[in-house]
Interface confidence: low
Amino acid sequence: MWQIVFFTLSCDLVLAAAYNNFRKSMDSIGKKQYQVQHGSCSYTFLLPEMDNCRSSSSPYVSNAVQRDAPLEYDDSVQRLQVLENIMENNTQWLMKLENYIQDNMKKEMVEIQQNAVQNQTAVMIEIGTNLLNQTAEQTRKLTDVEAQVLNQTTRLELQLLEHSLSTNKLEKQILDQTSEINKLQDKNSFLEKKVLAMEDKHIIQLQSIKEEKDQLQVLVSKQNSIIEELEKKIVTATVNNSVLQKQQHDLMETVNNLLTMMSTSNSAKDPTVAKEEQISFRDCAEVFKSGHTTNGIYTLTFPNSTEEIKAYCDMEAGGGGWTIIQRREDGSVDFQRTWKEYKVGFGNPSGEYWLGNEFVSQLTNQQRYVLKIHLKDWEGNEAYSLYEHFYLSSEELNYRIHLKGLTGTAGKISSISQPGNDFSTKDGDNDKCICKCSQMLTGGWWFDACGPSNLNGMYYPQRQNTNKFNGIKWYYWKGSGYSLKATTMMIRPADF
């Protein structure tokens, strides 16, 4: 049986005659053999399989719509041409085979004639008869093969017709699809126009909104500058007021001195000797004792150093002389600061600020200080906690807070955990919690785990100040979820 296969886009037909190595290689591909035996020689036809005779090109790809006919039609034509070639080859090979057999017969006959003895004539005739029979048999078989090839050709022609029909069908489908696509494109362009029109509309709307926004921004910036000017005027007025008060105080002192001088004019004292004024002050108590009894910002000098720091002094509350170390009042300053910032201080002494742990530590280790914490809620109530002994450890000990002797109206129990804890910030976690209290509750504070207070928490405005776990908290006065309106922490020597 003859069989045919396509390798990629061509059909290879192999004829092998008594070449063992060639046959081995073809056997390994697993193709069928057709064998003709002739004496000691055998003739083997190795032909590939008909079932696999398919084009290896990809089936009907997407861009095939652009072609005149589908790919399968081209394949059929190509295959038909190949089959015709094969037919021609087969005919030629059959003729060659006949000639070859006849040649062999002639050679054998000559050999027999040369070598035969008369008594072997009968054997020779028998051999000759056998050869003729075999030739006739092979010719018959070859005729069968030819008939089969013709059958295959007829079958392929039928397939080709079928393919032509399916091609026509496909072409019709493609035409339908093309018209559908055209319809969709029309719809699409209509929608695109609509979208573009809407976009134009939106751009116009956005521009008008932007213009409104710009106008608002101009208004806001104008208001801000007005507010800033007013603030500056207020500051100037406060300073002027402080200056006037100081001048008045100095005048009164001068008048008193003059009166004293007049009353003691007969004494031997030199009237030009005045009390030498202290130039540097360690805290607001010293400022107060030097005669400056007006609230305001004063320059303090660090103990045993020439370094200066500006602090707000409260010269009125509870006898005056208070150094303000913390103030919260309006949320204008961010208290979620680093260890370093809490160490050196930040903010504005006339507003919200933190004086600085290092200064407070050094100061409170020089002598005994009291700490007063003044609190305001959003309902107009005020309270305080007073600790009769307060100091901070050094930075090496994380500015640990030490407190003794609580009195006051902001709770019978200390809202700063006892014994005192180390100071913690967002970048310096020294609390007793697995969590990071400073990051969770915000602000630097002497957190426990995390403890009943945090006066450096988030500032929440009125009506947003309840149920806030990370607000400005003083538990034993207002509970855990209440965020206070204002706080002031102030220190003063115990012997003031």
């Epitope: 660090f302 150093s305 370094e307 370093k340 050196v344 201080g345 930040f346 504005n348 930075e395 090496e396």
Partner: antibody
Framework: QVQLVQSGAEVKKPGASVKVSCKAS????????LHWVRQAPGQRLEWMGW????????SYAQKFKDRVTITRDTSASTAYMELSSLRSEDTAVYYC????????????WGQGTLVTVSS | DIQMTQSPSSLSASVGDRVTITCKAS??????LAWYQQKPGKVPKLLIY???SLQTGVPSRFSGSGSGTDFTLTISSLQPEDVATYYC????????FGGGTKVEIK
Amino acid sequence: QVQLVQSGAEVKKPGASVKVSCKASGYTFTNHYLHWVRQAPGQRLEWMGWIGPTNGDTSYAQKFKDRVTITRDTSASTAYMELSSLRSEDTAVYYCAREGYFTNYFDYWGQGTLVTVSS
Amino acid sequence: DIQMTQSPSSLSASVGDRVTITCKASQNVIKYLAWYQQKPGKVPKLLIYNASSLQTGVPSRFSGSGSGTDFTLTISSLQPEDVATYYCLQYNSWWTFGGGTKVEIK
């Protein structure tokens, strides 16, 4: 008097690291924060980060966070700044600067170290 | 991050002239602003801190003013030795330098 003495100029290839030192003298090393500031040719000064005097805490500018490491050796009163994955745009003069005790500005500066990054 | 905008970027004035350099912060820095002078190939030198405080040893012709977001450095009478680039530095929230102002003599 207060002095900050930096290590000499360096030439590095892109992708390499550089480590610049800053030796402090004339003051108590553990009393002041030390900062690193750089200045590329013809550019503004640019703050890179600081190191705490006592516990060695560090903080870096967002821009350099992933590439800079500031360390210190208190016994040698020396701070170090290491910048990794160098690029040509890191070519600059690198300064160490001391922060005031109670003030946040820089009161003393090192003489600067020129780092050139070139292939 | 706070941005610092310095103006002008350069100026040329005669000896004895009054020179003014401004620095604008993108947000309120209260009074935490310093001015530095940097001569070519030299280290920055502190002139003014806390917006208006004159650093010890700095000539009194240098003065600073302003608060919040707008600050000014003034050289009352420009001298040849004042030729340099001047930088502002805000230190209220981290540290940011201005772009610098190059001062030259006409």
